[in-house]
């Protein structure tokens, strides 16, 4: 038997718009950086990329998303020092033989010149200059982004 | 006084940051249903464990993260059929030999009574009855959960 | 309760060695670098080392490089500092502290009580 | 490795009074800079960070500003529990640094 509340909350859930997103973050918290229509947290500590998307994911956040070379270049801009590298949201598909976003998208291959392997294990991380295939055990630092405004009709595809 | 939520949520709640909280959800997205003072995503479609966690993190959100049996039993009361599995945000730690939620903290033993095997690449799922261990490798549906609303000076030891 | 509590100190001859234990409790310890910090008697606060949550990256003061140890086991939610060839100036209240967020080495907001290391002969 | 370079190192002040400590590092940190109140025998406790950010539980009376190599920590109105050492510390590359301390005391 369900609760009054979880009833309602069927109810009221199936009768609103679809277009009334989550309000959307109108500032970045503290820590967060603001580069366009996202805030981006880079981390200061270091961990495996597995460790990385369960960090973000824990922040209601995801390992950043890059969209183009154009986007590549202004998030690199940020980085401060050219030695260190950060985790994003790419990571070698075995099954798929390919480069795959955590959104499920594969990489365009004229986004990111990446160095290095395509193969099991490997994920990838940026550096203020490059783009990098690395064994995703190793522990580097890592960006996790949240939206800064609500796309409005956007429809979050059937999970 | 403080009421069973409060007083058993102190690890999960642990997981997210308080300097990296968004103003909060008001309402619940669409296709997202209120569960008290979360907002929970159950996907229609399968997939692994490693990809629900990256699905969830893309929508800015976690894998669902249990408080006690009393959330337990009332997201329980959400699930429609018998027969559907869905993934939440705790995993089989080999290093640690643990059962370990998607935000660090270890499972507290009363809290979930566990079907199946405590070993490498099993996560657990939850049915309309019951909490199972499976392969991680398994494609079944996954639940994701928003916070509704920023709890004011809740420590939060994770990004 | 979130606490740390620090354990192992005690009188020590220089050149002898020590290990220090903080048993952390109350939150999600591994997703958490972790810090030692001292402070010598009458004397300022000290950074000594980190560790990151995983325990694969460590860093260390140049004062106690190639003398100190850091290490953590998450299943038991517990933070090391093994500490060889002692001197005299390594005489302080030994701190752990947990940072404020998971992605920071610092901005303590979590301390324990500390314990006391003393190096005389 | 930053300095960071704590002003004064001690202050006699009264209740009631407003005082300000500052805290100078030698290259920039942006606002990675956090403030830390001790008193003896104690662990210290956060008060301030990232340069302004109230901790929890932290009396309004006490606030940080200042980015890249200057900093303040302000008491507003100093009550009897604010006595005690003041530190500055450094969160924006490691080693982690702290500043030198200034000690806050009774006229």
């Known amino acids: 038997q369900k609760s009054s509340i979880e009833k309602c909350s069927v109810d009221i859930q199936q009768s609103r718009n679809k277009t009334t997103e989550r309000p959307g973050l109108l500032n970045c918290p503290i820590y967060w950086q603001q580069l366009r229509e996202k805030c981006l947290l880079f981390s200061h500590t270091v961990n495996p990329w597995n460790n990385s998307l369960a960090d973000c994911s824990t922040k209601e956040s995801s390992l950043l998303l890059i969209r183009d070379k154009d986007e590549l270049i202004h998030t690199q801009n940020l980085i401060r020092d050219k030695a260190i590298l950060f985790w994003i949201g790419l990571n070698f598909s075995l099954s798929e033989k390919n480069w795959k976003w955590i959104n499920g998208s594969f990489l365009n291959s004229n986004d990111l010149e990446i160095r290095g392997d395509a193969k099991e294990n490997s994920c990838i991380s940026i550096s203020q200059t490059s783009v990098y295939s690395e064994y995703c055990s190793t522990e580097i630092r890592w960006i996790c982004q949240k939206e800064l405004t609500p796309v409005r009709n956007k429809v979050y595809p059937d999970s | 006084q403080k009421s069973s939520i409060e007083k058993c949520s102190v690890d999960i709640q642990q997981s997210r940051n308080k300097t990296t909280e968004r103003p909060g959800l008001l309402n619940c997205p669409i296709y997202w249903q209120q569960l008290r003072e979360k907002c929970l995503l159950f996907s229609h479609t399968v997939n692994p464990w490693n990809n629900s966690l990256a699905d969830c993190s893309t929508k800015e959100s976690s894998l669902l993260l249990i408080r006690d049996k009393d959330e337990l039993i009332h997201t329980q009361n959400l699930i429609r059929d018998k027969a559907i599995l869905f993934w939440i945000g705790l995993n089989f730690s080999l290093s640690e030999k643990n059962w370990k939620w998607i935000n660090g903290s270890f499972l507290n033993s009363n809290d979930l009574e566990i079907r199946g095997d405590a070993k490498e690449n099993s996560c657990i799922s939850i049915s309309q009855t019951s909490v199972y261990s499976e392969y991680c490798s398994t494609e079944i549906r996954w639940i994701c959960q928003k916070e509704l609303t920023p709890v004011r000076n809740k420590v939060y030891p994770d990004s | 309760e979130v606490q740390l509590l620090e354990s192992g100190g005690g009188l020590v001859q220089p050149g002898g060695s020590l290990r220090l234990s903080c048993a952390a409790s109350?939150?999600?310890?591994?997703?958490?670098?972790m810090s030692w910090v001292r402070q010598a008697p009458g004397k300022g606060l000290e950074w000594v080392s980190a560790?990151?949550?995983?325990?694969?990256?460590?860093y260390y003061a140049d004062s106690v490089k190639g003398r100190f140890t850091i290490s953590r086991d998450n299943s038991k939610n517990t933070l090391y500092l093994q500490m060889n060839s002692l001197r005299a100036e390594d005489t302080a209240v030994y701190y752990c502290?947990?940072?404020?967020?998971?992605?920071?080495?610092?901005?303590?907001?979590?301390w324990g009580r500390g314990t006391l290391v003393t190096v005389s002969s | 490795d930053i300095q960071l370079t704590q002003s004064p190192s001690s202050v006699s002040a009264s209740v009631g009074d407003r005082v300000t400590i500052t805290c100078r590092a030698s290259?920039?940190?942006?606002?990675?800079l956090a403030w830390y109140q001790q008193k003896p025998g104690k662990a210290p406790k956060l008060l301030i960070y990232?340069?302004?950010s109230l901790q929890d539980g932290v009396p309004s009376r006490f606030s940080g500003s200042g980015s890249g190599t200057d900093f303040t920590l302000t008491i507003s109105s100093l009550q009897p529990e604010d006595f005690a050492t003041y530190y500055c510390?450094?969160?924006?590359?490691?080693?982690?640094?702290f500043g030198g301390g200034t000690k806050v005391e009774i006229k």
């Open positions: 510390q450094q969160a924006s590359v490691l080693p982690i640094t």
């Open positions: 109350g939150f999600a310890f591994s997703t958490y670098a």
């Open positions: 560790i990151s949550g995983v325990g694969g990256t460590t």
């Open positions: 502290a947990k940072p404020l967020d998971s992605s920071l080495w610092a901005d303590f907001d979590l």
């Open positions: 290259q920039g940190i942006s606002s990675w």
């Open positions: 990232y340069a302004s």
